[in-house]
């Protein structure tokens, strides 16, 4: 996911939308104006606000890399919402990139779990029932490594 | 507790320039998102312009663009805005603020209105 416009000096003109802030403060698909008076609405499918908020700038809007599905468009109020296509997830610790889901399980592993936008295939020794952890290659028919991707520990 | 001390203001012709300074101490300074904000004689505050801590992300109101710059120096803890081609409506207190509750969103810093920690101010008078 990336910013749409990482150079936030080129300020938009102000929109034609205006409004008092209440104590201070102005709704959701709006910011506040330069003097604090008034309540200025963001422009649909650039940014958005989501909260009562004394923003100077709404925040801008982000675009769904290639590799992702747009599940729904910002709007004023409410910042896209982007998805990785199938066949790929994003983990938690690395949400900057969708990766590829694998493909099966290495031998004396099944599959528990299938590929999601948000995990892998979650596989687990037949006999014991442990998760794998880590990243397999091998499939289960296939389960020799390619060079310099060794098959990783289960724990 | 931060403080701040701006300094540099003065009386400037029209189409002179100036440069704001604001020290700060009792912080971490390069962890504090900033901003100038001003107030001319009988009216309210008006934010001015904005810099993240890491100075890559900068603010301006659109009646300084193109006129003003911030920028900061976190090895001197010291903030400045540079001013040029002064206007009579330029004239007013410049404060220099620093935002506690800071917005960031994608990585990006968004200033509030409502920055918290606030200089005593520096007088800019611009007259023939």
């Known amino acids: 996911i990336t910013q749409q416009d990482l150079a936030p000096q080129q300020r938009a003109a102000p929109q034609q939308k205006r409004s008092s802030p209440s104590e201070g403060l102005c709704p959701p698909g709006h910011h506040i104006s330069e003097d604090g008076r008034d309540c200025i609405s963001c422009k649909y499918g650039q940014d958005y606000s989501t909260h009562w908020n004394d923003l100077l700038f709404c925040l801008r809007c982000t675009r769904c890399d290639s590799g992702e599905v747009e599940l729904s468009p910002c709007t004023t109020t409410r910042n896209t919402v982007c998805q990785c296509e199938e066949g790929t997830f994003r983990e938690e610790d690395s949400p900057e990139m969708c990766r590829k889901c694998r493909t099966g399980c290495p031998r004396g592993m099944v599959k528990v779990g299938d590929c999601t936008p948000w995990s892998d295939i979650e596989c687990v020794h037949k006999e014991s029932g442990t998760k794998h952890s880590g990243e397999v290659p091998a499939v289960e028919e296939t389960v020799t490594s390619s060079p310099g991707t060794p098959a990783s520990p289960c724990s | 507790e931060v403080q701040l001390l701006e300094s540099g203001g003065g009386e400037v012709q029209p189409g002179g320039s100036l440069r704001l300074s604001c020290a700060a101490s009792g912080s971490t300074f390069s962890s504090l998102d900033m901003g100038w904000f001003r107030q001319a004689p009988g009216k309210g505050r008006e934010f001015v312009s904005a810099?993240?801590?890491?100075?890559?992300?900068?603010y301006y109101a659109e009646s300084v663009k193109g006129r003003f710059t911030i920028s900061r120096d976190n090895a001197k803890n010291t903030l400045y805005l540079q001013m040029s081609s002064l206007r009579a409506e330029d004239t007013a207190v410049y404060y220099c603020?620093?935002?506690?509750?800071?917005?960031?969103?994608?990585?990006?810093?968004?200033?509030?209105?409502?920055?918290?920690?606030w200089g005593q101010g520096t007088l800019v008078t611009v007259k023939p």
């Open positions: 810099i993240s801590r890491s100075g890559d992300n900068i």
């Open positions: 603020a620093v935002d506690t509750q800071p917005t960031y969103s994608g990585g990006v810093y968004y200033p509030r209105y409502g920055m918290d920690v």
